[in-house]
């Protein structure tokens, strides 16, 4: 902590410039008012000071804010932000998405920082929810933002939101979040016609059921194998052979190179050989003609 | 063809919990998404949230802090637990199932089960 | 939440004529809704989803019309089965809601 002395003659400043960088540390703690550094928050950023002299002007507003800074402050921080710690971060009460974005800017191409994290989680639990505008400004500045949130979080995103979510900010959800995000995307591209649909839900199959997915290769869209690949196996398993045609269209030959993988893998050896060799693709593994299924699961769920 | 079965008590205490199970017979649990609705007696219908089979779940706001929806895959069932219950939560549960493959969206319900009454009473 | 008001809340009609159910949402749902036939001692039961599609087994005397806030339930010619309750609901956002229902009852 820096040590109180009195500000020398004729150093009390009376507005932030660019005459402070040539301030010790100790005149800056005793010249500088906190008062004033808040009120003119937003020249600290185009002042070039030096680590140490932020630590001391960050003090100052500490002294001055025991109980967190106020947003009129926090919106001007720039370059002192970095300076927080989540400690910090967690008294404030941000609510303006203009200071959300001030602030993401300055640590903008860097990781998601802890303060950032910190910061995101404040606000957004002080709006209740996760909204389309601040979703928007998350995945601007940290595109697997929606990725790193638990499913838990992720259920107080609401339908509205999603128009805001793009293929890319899906790219590392798993099957869990996939799960929370799918129904709430099926709820908010229900209004759009069929091929428009397709565009917009394709990002999302990940966490479809089986009867959606049913539906879907009613609708001549025309899956990639891409998409296919992302499918939960256990919605894949029951469809038939017919279905999977459908679904992928013309990209059904692209399972033959896939046949060694999950989910298409799985899926052939639930197949009837005769069933896939309509296909033409030579895919292999099949049940060999004659043999009985029995769905072990499903007898199971009835006794 | 599927068919689905409410089972619980039919009396709770107020501020006991809730707890009622919904069997899924003749399909499979894992095609789509499954609800709990209620009715109060001479009243309409509420609709209290679903489930999907890995467990993800999404509930009506004016419930949500008293609800817990939960599903077992083993067995074909998912589950409604409702704590802290009053005289006002007395009423005819429903478990539903919402639509599959008459659309590709859509949250309504084309099969229901016949309903069982709980009475929150001392 | 979406407030769905059905009207009237009872109606009487005599068997063979149409009658007509009104169902308008606080906001608008687009075609997000459906409607459903209860009868005491049941469940309900799927009539009209997307505002006019009749659901599987559904009789052609029953119709929906209508989009965004202002929907209509048309059974054209009442049979004696048909006299029940009967419930709107939007599936245009969370929280689903429905109407507090109509009771067709016979004149």
């Known amino acids: 902590e820096v040590e109180k002395t009195a500000c020398p003659s004729g150093k009390k400043a009376r507005e932030i410039d660019e005459s402070l960088i040539f301030y010790k540390k100790w005149e800056l703690e005793a010249c500088v008012d906190a008062a004033l550094l808040a009120t003119q928050m937003d020249r600290v950023n185009a002042i070039p000071f030096t680590y140490e002299q932020l630590d001391v002007l960050k003090h100052k507003l500490d002294e001055l804010y025991p109980q967190g800074y106020p947003e009129s402050v926090i919106q001007h921080l720039g370059y002192l932000f970095l300076k927080m710690s989540p400690e910090d971060i967690r008294k404030w009460n941000v609510t303006s998405l203009e200071t959300l974005k001030a602030l993401l800017e300055v640590n903008k191409g860097h990781e998601m920082s802890p303060q950032v994290a910190t910061l995101i989680d404040r606000f957004v639990k002080g709006r209740g929810q996760l909204d389309k505008d601040t979703l928007d400004t998350l995945t601007a500045f940290y595109p697997g933002y929606l990725c790193s949130l638990s499913p838990e979080e992720l259920s107080s995103v609401p339908p509205s939101s999603i128009w805001a979510v793009r293929p890319q900010d899906l790219d590392t959800c798993d099957p869990r979040q996939l799960d929370v995000l799918y129904p709430k995307a099926r709820l908010a591209f229900q209004n759009m016609n069929g091929s428009e649909y397709f565009v917009k839900i394709q990002s999302f199959l990940g966490g479809a059921p089986t009867e959606d997915l049913k539906a879907l290769s009613q609708q001549n869209v025309s899956m990639d194998l891409a998409t296919f690949m992302k499918l939960r196996t256990d919605a894949v398993l029951p469809l038939t052979v017919a279905e999977v045609q459908k679904l992928l269209g013309p990209h059904v030959e692209g399972l033959k190179a896939e046949e060694r993988h999950r989910p298409v893998r799985d899926w052939i050896l639930r197949q009837r050989q005769d069933d896939l060799d309509t296909l033409g693709l030579g895919l292999q593994g099949g049940i060999p003609n004659g043999y009985l299924v029995l769905d072990l699961s499903m007898q199971e769920a009835l006794s | 063809q599927v068919q689905l079965q409410e089972s619980g008590p039919g009396l709770v205490k107020p501020s006991e919990t809730l707890s009622l199970t919904c069997t899924v017979s003749?399909?499979?649990?894992?095609?789509?998404?499954w609800s709990w609705v209620r009715q109060p007696p001479g009243k309409g219908l509420e609709w209290i949230g679903y489930?999907?089979?890995?467990?993800?779940?999404q509930s009506n706001p004016s419930l949500k802090s008293r609800v817990i929806i939960s599903v077992d895959t083993s067995k074909n069932q998912f589950s409604l637990k409702l704590s802290s219950v009053t005289a006002a939560d007395t009423a005819v549960y429903y478990c539903a199932r919402e639509v599959g493959r008459i659309a590709v969206a859509g949250w309504f319900f084309d099969l229901w089960g016949r309903g069982t009454l709980v009475t929150v009473s001392s | 939440e979406i407030v769905m008001t059905q009207s009237p809340a009872t109606l009487s009609v005599s068997p063979g004529e149409r009658a007509t159910l009104s169902c308008r949402a606080s906001?608008?749902?687009?075609?997000?809704l459906a409607w459903y036939q209860q009868k005491p001692g049941q469940a309900p039961r799927l009539l009209i989803y997307g505002a006019s599609t009749r659901a599987t087994g559904i009789p052609a005397r029953f119709s929906g019309s209508g989009s965004g806030t202002e929907f209509t339930l048309t059974i054209s010619s009442l049979q004696s089965e048909d006299f029940a309750v009967y419930y709107c609901?939007?599936?245009?956002?969370?929280?689903?809601?429905f109407g507090q229902g109509t009771r067709l009852e016979i004149k």
């Open positions: 489930i999907f089979y890995s467990g993800s779940t």
């Open positions: 609901q939007q599936y245009n956002n969370w929280p689903l809601t």
């Open positions: 003749g399909g499979s649990i894992q095609n789509y998404y």
């Open positions: 906001q608008s749902v687009n075609s997000n």
